[in-house]
């Protein structure tokens, strides 16, 4: 059974995939697909890297971590309740049946809805939510900047996001590896 | 546009082993997006996958010839081979090399066919 | 290994007709599901992959659908030169599996 990753409407999903370079620089291919892993390839790919580089992409797919050290998981962008389902991430391993295949089923919520006095500033305009990204896009930053009047909730809310934030950090670093060669 | 061009014999003694060599016109063996195979059909019979070999290396065989099979690929020569090792009358059919784009799996070429007769 | 289970075995038509050919399969294959014309002498062409996109090159009077484990091909209107084997191709689990094939001849 596949393992499920959640992320909220608007936000970015983040689904994990490793492998260990033979050494550093020397890549295998790599797809990532929307729906299960089949026989060769990735059904409807959204991602492909080769030996060198990320060789094709489609908007929102891009890959967040440092690919050349084996880090090929899909950051999708601004998800959608569409976006829900399962994806595949194939590392083609050179060699007699040796690749490897995971399938990550991703679950999209819908955003939650805090309602907020009128005269407070929206809750995601005074806590800009910003993964640090490297090496697709501009450099940005988690930051909570001057506090300005919030309730209880939004303070839960906060909480909760930056335990969320925590846990994708865990996931991320606790993830499955594959080592090569 | 990819051409396949086969070629070997098309009578093996049983026991001996089956070689096929499928060499490629009009595009690299060694560039990304193709995954060359093999595929044979006995005779009045449907057909059966026997496995291929990836642009990366990576190979896959059918598990019932698992054990008899070896699919090459050779770079400098623009070919990838089919040997078949112990071969009995069962192994009597015709086998097509084929190479299956990868980038969507919309197109796909395929060899004449090899007529290959296992017969003392 | 998955088994694919193609009916009719034989399908006889006249030019002009439409043809329904079905393919089930004995586990789900999700979209993975290719169909292949072959005609005597000739080694098979790719007609559809992904259950329902036509492959390059391919007349539109081909179209295929279904998800699971149920597919069907349509040929809208045969022409001579259709006449001949069709199979359905797996491409979810190893090993790659076909169906037996149905054969479209001229009634």
């Known amino acids: 059974s596949e393992v499920e990753y959640r992320a909220e409407v608007g936000q970015n999903a983040y689904l994990p995939c490793f492998y260990t370079p033979a050494a550093p620089g020397n890549l295998v291919p790599v797809c990532w697909g929307k729906g299960a892993c089949p026989v060769f390839e990735c059904g409807n790919v959204v991602l492909r890297t080769d030996e060198r580089d990320v060789n094709y992409w489609t908007s929102r797919y891009w890959l967040n971590g440092d690919f050349r050290k084996g880090d090929v998981s899909l950051t999708i962008e601004n998800v959608t309740l569409a976006d829900s389902g399962i994806y595949c991430c194939r590392i083609q391993i050179p060699g007699i049946m040796n690749d490897e295949k995971f399938n990550l089923k991703l679950v999209i919520k819908p955003a939650k809805v805090t309602p907020a006095p009128t005269r407070q500033r929206d809750f995601t305009a005074a806590f800009p939510r910003m993964l640090t990204t490297r090496g697709h896009g501009p450099a940005e930053t988690q930051t909570l900047g001057s506090l300005p009047d919030i309730n209880l909730t939004q303070i839960s809310t906060l909480a909760n996001e930056l335990r969320d934030s925590r846990l994708a950090n865990d996931l991320r670093d606790s993830g499955a590896t594959i080592r090569i060669g | 546009q990819v051409q396949l061009q086969q070629s070997g014999p098309g009578l093996v003694k049983p026991s001996h082993t089956l070689s096929l060599t499928c060499t490629v016109s009009g595009g690299s063996i060694s560039s990304g997006g193709y995954y060359w195979s093999w595929t044979r059909q006995h005779p009045g019979m449907g057909l059966e996958w026997i496995g291929y070999i990836s642009y990366s290396g990576s190979i896959y065989y059918t598990p019932s010839l698992k054990s008899r099979l070896t699919i090459s690929v050779d770079t400098s020569k623009n070919q990838f081979s089919l040997k078949l090792s112990s071969v009995t009358a069962a192994d009597t059919a015709v086998y097509y090399c084929a190479s299956l784009d990868s980038w969507g799996s919309n197109r796909d070429y395929w060899g004449q066919g090899t007529l290959v007769t296992v017969s003392s | 290994e998955i088994v694919l289970t193609q009916s009719p075995a034989t399908l006889s038509l006249s030019p002009g007709e439409r043809a329904t050919l079905s393919c089930r399969a004995s586990q789900s294959v999700s979209s993975y599901l290719a169909w292949y014309q072959q005609k005597p002498g000739q080694a098979p062409r790719l007609l559809i992959y992904?259950?329902?996109n036509r492959a390059t090159g391919i007349p539109a009077r081909f179209s295929g659908s279904g998800s699971g484990t149920d597919f069907t091909l349509t040929i809208s209107s045969l022409e001579p030169e259709d006449f001949a084997v069709y199979y359905c191709q797996q491409r979810s689990n190893w090993p790659l599996t076909f169906g037996g094939g149905t054969k479209v001849e001229i009634k």
């Open positions: 992904d259950a329902s």
